[in-house]
């Protein structure tokens, strides 16, 4: 039975050219996290973080994605095209798969606020 919940940074906004931290957190379960996948709105993979083997950053993003903090991902040099949904998929044993959603809005405005609140989707 899957008892866990994924908390995410929810809806966030950041400045064009800036950076943003995409963060998910799995709670309320004793399941072991074996792997976390990060996907972009078009379902292309940004990165994989295997618990033992470390990070795999996809070549298309290698200059703009930094692993961490923790199981999260830092997206740098933001463009307007980065606006959209991001998904963290937690592969766990024995529970199975948990999935969280973050919506990122990249703003031209210099007054873009970076909200870092955690939400349960």
């Amino acid at each position: 039975m899957m008892t866990g919940t994924i908390e995410t940074t929810g809806n966030i906004s950041a400045k064009k050219g800036g950076s943003v931290i995409l963060q998910c957190h799995l709670s309320s379960t004793m399941a072991q996290v074996t792997q976390v996948n990060w996907e972009q709105h078009d379902h292309s993979l940004l990165a994989i973080r295997n618990a033992e083997l470390g990070w795999h950053i996809y070549p298309a993003f290698k200059d703009r994605v930094a692993p961490g903090p923790g199981l999260g991902l830092t997206l740098q040099s933001l463009t307007m095209n980065d606006t959209g949904e991001y998904f963290c998929t937690y592969h766990t044993y024995p529970d199975g798969t948990y999935r969280g959603r973050i919506f990122l809005e990249v703003l031209e405005s210099s007054v873009a606020e970076h909200s870092a609140r955690f939400q349960i989707p």
Epitope: G54, W55, H56, P67
Partner: antibody
Framework: QVQLVQSGAEVKKPGASVKVSCKAS????????MHWVRQAPGQRLEWIGG????????SYSQKFQGRATLTVDTSASTAYMELSSLRSEDTAVYYC????????????WGQGTTVTVSS | DIQMTQSPSSLSASVGDRVTITCQAS??????LAWYQQKPGKAPKLLIY???YRYTGVPSRFSGSGSGTDFTFTISSLQPEDIATYYC?????????FGGGTKLEIK
């Protein structure tokens, strides 16, 4: 240049254990995970498992869990693969291979170590 | 475990031919796929990573494409030195798995 140099061929009896070494040079050993892949005669490549030299974290194929042990000696930039309870089906060429920096593809391979299990 | 089905298992082609090998994953692996070349008695060599990126020093006649479950490896103009066995490899999730290989021969 990057080099992975493996220990020599081994002949073992069924039930015995074998330990294969892989000496790495030409890069920072702790920055790349090391993997072990085997190839039985005429068969496909088979992933045994991988180890992260940075923290000695290991990931094994379920098939080899409990029978294969991956270790590293970071001071000697050497990885080891020990396989126990050998059977004839373990006769194969065993390769160490590292995964690319921040990638999972396998970019450098050792020359292979032939392990023959025969009574 | 993710099964990787490679076809054909062997093929014979002439120098200068366009050669295509396919690899099918039993589930979606996005673009977490690499292709390797192995010559008899030698270790495999990385040719293509992340489905479509040519590894450093690999000739431009080698290319890869695909995502999800269906992948293609192409040699645009076969050269005598390309005679080898080619393997696909998924690293989307452990245990990492390989295709059964395609043995390429010259006609």
């Amino acid at each position: 240049q990057v080099q992975l140099v493996q220990s020599g061929a081994e002949v073992k009896k069924p039930g015995a254990s074998v330990k294969v070494s892989c000496k790495a040079s030409g890069y920072t050993f702790t920055e790349n995970a090391m993997h072990w892949v085997r190839q039985a005669p005429g068969q496909r490549l088979e992933w045994i498992g991988g180890i992260n030299p940075n923290n000695a974290g290991t990931s094994y194929s379920q098939k080899f869990q409990g029978r294969a042990t991956l270790t590293v000696d970071t001071s000697a930039s050497t990885a080891y693969m020990e396989l126990s309870s050998l059977r004839s089906e373990d006769t194969a060429v065993y390769y160490c291979t590292r995964s690319s920096y921040y990638r999972y593809d396998l970019d450098y391979w050792g020359q292979g170590t032939t392990v023959t299990v025969s009574s | 475990d993710i099964q990787m089905t490679q076809s054909p298992s062997s093929l014979s082609a002439s120098v200068g031919d366009r050669v295509t090998i396919t690899c099918q994953a039993s589930q979606d692996i996005k673009t977490a796929l690499a292709w390797y070349q192995q010559k008899p008695g030698k270790a495999p060599k990385l040719l293509i990573y992340s489905a479509s990126y040519r590894y450093t020093g690999v000739p431009s006649r080698f290319s890869g494409s695909g995502s999800g479950t269906d992948f293609t490896f192409t040699i645009s103009s076969l050269q005598p030195e390309d005679i080898a066995t080619y393997y696909c490899h998924q690293h989307y999730t452990t245990p990492w798995t390989f295709g059964g290989g395609t043995k390429l021969e010259i006609k």
